[in-house]
């Protein structure tokens, strides 16, 4: 799985979404886990209704909420009021027994302001060997990225790269 | 081990800059954050910033913004504070310290030794 | 920003003593706070996070507590390794802000 960056600013609300195949996943309940570490195992934050027909019910655990889009395939968590300790890997998992299958990894970031993130005169263009040509750029408050690369300086787009 | 192994004391001129280094081991760098903190002589410490070396997100103390940039080079494992414009007020020690898992949740585990910045004409 | 008023600024003990050192917060931290030491060559240790969680191989003599918007670290019976610099650390909303410390110096 490649990670996803999700940006957002201390003290207002981000929104996560984990797109899925809603044939493949029809009747599994979905979560939203954290990983506090390289090992061990993800941690429970909060998971959609224990009925999946009532899955498109907010359902919150503090600050976070979830809710599916079972027919669309799209999994949203809310981060309200976000804080620095929010920071972090996350994963958007699909339910089906014991098992858990990873939809999404998410790295989420907080920022303390929005301009933080890079300097306007700091661009970074693509080399030789790197190629943005299908990076395909939806407005949003948070940036998707694949592992190991270096983001574009805006904090206002998410970039999806398939 | 991990370690932290912060660049040497310099001795730089009013006006001038200076760029620091802290460098990682023991550890996968890009895992986890790094925060930058300064202790003026006999005083107290001030968090300057943090950065995410897996993305080169940054956060900064407003006080320190303009005067402080944080960059990583995610090949040597090694994260930089420049400071620009030096005055007096700058002469302190710089510590790096590593965040936690991708965060700062638990603080700020390990620290770097610290480099001494002396501003003089 | 979270103001960290740390006291006392300065305790004078003798080795075995029992000490306690109090952080006030200026706004809620839910915990998010840590304990520093600093020895005189600069070298700094994190003793505590979470309010109260031990860090490992930090003797079992020092502990952190939390009462309300107070946070406090005490070392039951100080021992002469114990004798330096310790600060508050706040770490639940930027900028992240530290005590002013308190210089540990023995009697």
């Known amino acids: 799985h490649n990670t996803t960056v999700f940006q957002g600013v201390a003290g207002q609300s981000l929104q996560v979404s984990c797109p899925y195949d809603s044939m493949k996943h029809w009747g599994r309940r979905k979560a939203w886990c954290r990983q506090l570490g390289e090992k061990g195992p993800c941690q429970r934050v909060v998971s959609t209704h224990n009925l999946w027909l009532l899955s498109f019910l907010r359902r919150w655990n503090g600050s976070t909420a979830i809710t599916d889009d079972t027919l669309g395939g799209t999994l949203t968590i809310t981060l309200r009021n976000l804080q620095p300790h929010d920071a972090g890997l996350y994963q958007c998992q699909s339910l089906h027994g014991s098992e858990a299958d990873t939809l999404r990894k998410v790295l989420v970031e907080v920022l303390a302001d929005p301009l933080d993130h890079r300097d306007a005169g700091d661009l970074w263009f693509p080399g030789e060997s790197e190629s943005f040509e299908d990076a395909h750029v939806e407005h949003s408050i948070s940036r998707s990225l694949l592992e190991g690369e270096i983001p574009f300086p805006p904090t206002s787009h998410h970039h999806h790269h398939h | 081990e991990l370690q932290l192994q912060e660049s040497g004391p310099v001795l730089v001129k009013p006006g001038a800059s200076v760029k620091m280094s802290c460098k990682a081991s023991g550890y996968t760098f890009t895992d986890y954050y790094m925060n930058w903190v300064k202790q003026s002589h006999g005083k107290s410490l001030e968090w300057i910033g943090v950065i995410n070396p897996y993305t080169g997100a940054t956060s900064y103390n407003q006080k320190f913004k303009g005067k402080a940039t944080l960059t990583v080079d995610k090949s040597s494992s090694t994260a930089y504070m420049e400071l620009n414009s030096l005055t007096s007020e700058d002469s302190a020690v710089y510590y790096c310290?590593?965040?936690?898992?991708?965060?700062?949740?638990?603080?700020?585990?390990?620290w770097g030794q610290g480099t001494l910045v002396t501003v003089s004409a | 920003d979270i103001q960290m008023t740390q006291s006392p600024s300065s305790l004078s003990a003798s080795l075995g003593e029992r000490v306690s050192l109090t952080c006030r917060a200026s706004?809620?931290?839910?915990?998010?706070l840590s304990w520093l030491q600093q020895k005189p060559d600069g070298t700094i240790k994190r003793l505590i996070y979470a309010a109260s969680t031990l860090d490992s191989g930090v003797p079992k003599r020092f502990s952190g507590s939390r009462s309300g918007s107070d946070y406090s670290l005490t070392i039951s019976s100080l021992e002469s390794e114990d004798f330096a610099d310790y600060y508050c650390?706040?770490?639940?909303?930027?900028?992240?802000?530290f005590g002013g410390g308190t210089k540990l110096e023995i009697k």
């Open positions: 310290a590593r965040g936690t898992y991708y965060s700062n949740y638990e603080g700020f585990p390990y």
């Open positions: 706004q809620e931290i839910s915990g998010y």
């Open positions: 650390l706040q770490y639940a909303s930027y900028p992240y802000t």
